[in-house]
């Protein structure tokens, strides 16, 4: 048993059949020491009596808000919550696998530039009784800080007969230089809680393996005299770090219809210019990524041919 | 510390083409070692992430944007002393912080020259005769320090009479493609930089 | 299978029009572009133009502007290439070729020998 | 134009060997190169699309790198069927233009 935060405690559970539990003593915080009894969430039904509760947790039966009292007044709580570990492996029952960039991915991280500044998220089919916490460092044993904010819920899906929700959180490392060369990673941990399940997530990677541009800006077209060129120009996004000269982007531009399985022309350039055959309906779409270190593409930046 | 000679302006700066080379063959050398020593800890996931040059040079502090030297984050720099006569140097437009950081560029990739040859003729007797350094890589560290032309005491190649394990062998050589694939892209960053100013 | 099936070798004398075709199979026609290269004996690749079938889009490379035709029927599924004005440089092996990215080239015909002689 | 450059314009090598074929162009064209191979009296077969992105169907002895103006196709273990001529051809600007070839000879 291990203390989350104030009068809120998380007991490690091996899940299985006629497992034999958890032995767990609640000390009442208070310097009374008679007519002290406890009771469990809104049951009157007294489980006993005395400064100390010893109890056998085994299931989620067992779990929740222990309160001890003395004549009719509350003295204090302990939330004890549940993690359940099945085959040697930690119960992730609350978040939905991404499997994206590979299997068990609960949570996914993107950065916009190198500015120490990040995006995680993470997916649930769950919509109530359901927190989260987040902590961030860089490294582990004598780590370096990064503050995150409180984790939100950023978008709502419908995937089938399922609701799907979407939460979020941004971080930011507290003391980062954008030219740096990271050699301890980002650890990011997420404590999740439905109902009085607990759960932990965790992800380690250094920024610029997250690096993830917004699309180029202010796409402009202009047509070549006497040719069906042509020539497309943007700017870098203004989220992007700078300088550019040293910070540089490479560019891939394509003119596609609107099906994929349309015919394309495509070509890559480290310029903020390029010359491209339009078609009518199509389209000509700009995407970036770093020009050194090859982490993800942005997302399409379009604008129609015609 | 002397400042560079002055060079007739080489307009593009001559640097950029070899340091675009250099990064190009490290990526392909570290695709190469993570494809056939798949069975070994050598993806960035598993490696500890060393860097051989710290503190005996501070690239990333030398060779700084002037408008990352305002960011706080970015000045913890190390003092270290250099030789400097490039002839990467534009001449004249060369300010002392550049020579410095070019001459750091050259100690970097010295230090690798060197660990990259000692690791090369450790592999060499291995008689799984599982991989070997691309010759094309060392090829190219050594154009790129004949285009940076500094004058440098040269290190000794470091011999070793113990029987090498080549599996230790073998996760080091990962280790050191990855750190100098990460000092490989602050290099082309810098030249970029530079042949834009 | 996508594919690509030429014209017959032709044979022309220097001031001439050839006009050879290539019949494509296994696809939509109109949903790839089609290109022609051209490869004169002990010699490398010459690249002439291509053309858009949907639309009738054409471009030709400079060096045969104004010789070069390139027309496409979607009724017959068949790319033809026109080259006139024939020199003896002209004799060569002619390949259409085609793909859905405009500028490289996936699928080839077999190619078609047109020589121009005297 | 953009001229494409070859080398070497030959080389014999053995069954086994690794061979590296390179291709250089007259101005920059960030990896809008691609590579194909041609057998006498055949038309040639794409390779490698975009300087190093495999082609599916290619065995996986032939990759190919680079960028800007500098590329490279590697041939890791030559097979008896690996020897005929290589072109490689930019995509950068039109006109479309190829290298001169390198033939893969027999030692």
């Known amino acids: 048993i291990w203390e989350l935060k104030k009068d809120v405690y998380v007991v490690e559970l091996d899940w299985y059949p006629d497992a034999p539990g958890e032995m767990v003593v609640l000390t009442c915080d208070t310097p009374e020491e008679d007519g002290i009894t406890w009771t469990l969430d809104q049951s009157s039904e007294v489980l006993g009596s005395g400064k100390t509760l010893t109890i056998q947790v085994k299931e989620f039966g067992d779990a929740g808000q222990y309160t001890c009292h003395k004549g009719g007044e509350v003295l204090s709580h302990s939330l004890l919550l549940l993690h359940k570990k099945e085959d040697g492996i930690w119960s992730t029952d609350i978040l939905k696998d991404q499997k994206e960039p590979k299997n068990k991915t609960f949570l996914r991280c993107e950065a916009k530039n190198y500015s120490g500044r990040f995006t995680c998220w993470w997916l649930t089919t769950i919509s109530t009784d359901l927190t989260f916490s987040v902590k961030s460092s860089r490294g582990s044993s004598d780590p370096q800080g990064v503050t995150c904010g409180a984790a939100t819920l950023s978008a709502e899906r419908v995937r089938g007969d399922n609701k799907e929700y979407e939460y979020s959180v941004e971080c930011q490392e507290d003391s980062a230089c954008p030219a740096a060369e990271e050699s301890l990673p980002i650890e990011v941990m997420v404590d999740a809680v439905h109902k009085l399940k607990y759960e932990n997530y965790t992800s380690s990677f250094f920024i610029r393996d997250i690096i993830k541009p917004d699309p180029p800006k202010n796409l402009q077209l202009k047509p070549l005299k006497n040719s069906r060129q042509v020539e497309v120009s943007w700017e870098y996004p203004d989220t992007w770090s700078t300088p550019h000269s040293y910070f540089s982007l490479t560019f891939c531009v394509q003119v596609q219809g609107k099906s994929k399985r349309e015919k394309k022309d495509r070509v890559f350039t480290d310029k903020t210019s390029a010359t491209v055959i339009c078609r009518k309906n199509a389209s000509i779409s700009v995407r970036a990524q770093d020009r050194y270190y090859s982490s993800s593409w942005s997302e399409w930046a379009s604008v129609p041919c015609s | 510390r002397n400042l560079p000679v002055a060079t007739p302006d080489p307009g593009m700066f001559p640097c950029l083409h070899h340091s675009q080379n250099l990064l190009r063959a490290v990526s392909n050398m570290l695709q190469k070692a993570r494809q056939t020593l798949e069975f070994y800890p050598c993806t960035s996931e598993e490696i500890d992430h060393e860097d051989i040059t710290k503190d005996k040079t501070s690239t990333v502090e030398a060779c700084l944007p002037l408008e990352l030297t305002k960011n706080e984050s970015c000045l913890n720099s190390r003092e270290t002393s250099f030789i400097t006569n490039g002839s990467c140097l534009a001449s004249r437009k060369t300010s002392f912080m550049m020579a410095l950081c070019l001459s750091s560029i050259y100690e970097d990739l010295k230090m690798y020259q060197v660990e990259f040859k000692t690791m090369n003729a450790k592999l060499l007797m291995d008689p799984k005769r599982q991989i070997f350094l691309d010759q094309n890589m060392l090829a190219v560290i050594d154009e790129l320090m004949q285009a940076l032309n500094f004058n440098s005491e040269t290190v000794p190649q470091k011999s070793s009479l113990e029987e090498p394990d080549f599996y230790k062998t073998k996760i080091k050589l990962c280790i050191l493609l990855h750190a100098f694939r990460i000092r490989a892209v602050t290099i082309d960053r810098v030249m970029s930089y530079l042949n834009a100013s | 299978e996508v594919q690509l099936v030429q014209s017959g070798a032709e044979v022309k004398k220097p001031g001439a029009t050839v006009k050879i075709s290539c019949k494509a199979s296994g696809y939509t026609f109109s949903d790839y572009y089609l290109h022609w290269v051209r490869q004169r004996p002990g010699k490398g690749l010459e690249w002439m133009g291509w053309?858009?079938?949907?639309?009738?889009?054409?471009e030709y490379a400079p060096k045969f502007q104004g010789r070069v035709t390139i027309t496409a029927d979607t009724s017959t599924d068949t790319g033809y290439l026109e080259l006139s004005s024939l020199r003896s440089e002209d004799t060569a092996v002619y390949y259409c070729a085609a793909n859905k990215e405009l500028r490289y080239f996936d699928v080839w015909g077999q190619g078609t020998l047109v020589t121009v002689s005297s | 134009d953009i001229q494409m450059t070859q080398s070497p314009s030959s080389v014999s090598a053995s069954v086994g060997d690794r061979v590296t074929i390179t291709c250089r162009a007259s101005?920059?064209?960030?990896?809008?190169l691609h590579w194909y191979q041609q057998k006498p009296g055949k038309a040639p077969k794409l390779l490698i699309k975009?300087?190093?992105q495999s082609i599916s169907g290619v065995p996986s002895r032939f990759s190919g790198s680079g960028s800007g103006t500098d590329f490279s196709l590697t041939i890791n273990s030559l097979q008896p069927e690996d020897f005929a001529t290589y072109y490689c051809?930019?995509?950068?600007?039109?006109?479309?233009?190829f290298g001169g070839g390198t033939k893969v000879e027999i030692k």
């Open positions: 053309i858009d079938p949907e639309n009738g889009d054409t």
């Open positions: 975009f300087a190093s």
């Open positions: 101005q920059s064209i960030s990896i809008n």
């Open positions: 051809q930019q995509s950068n600007s039109f006109p479309l233009t």
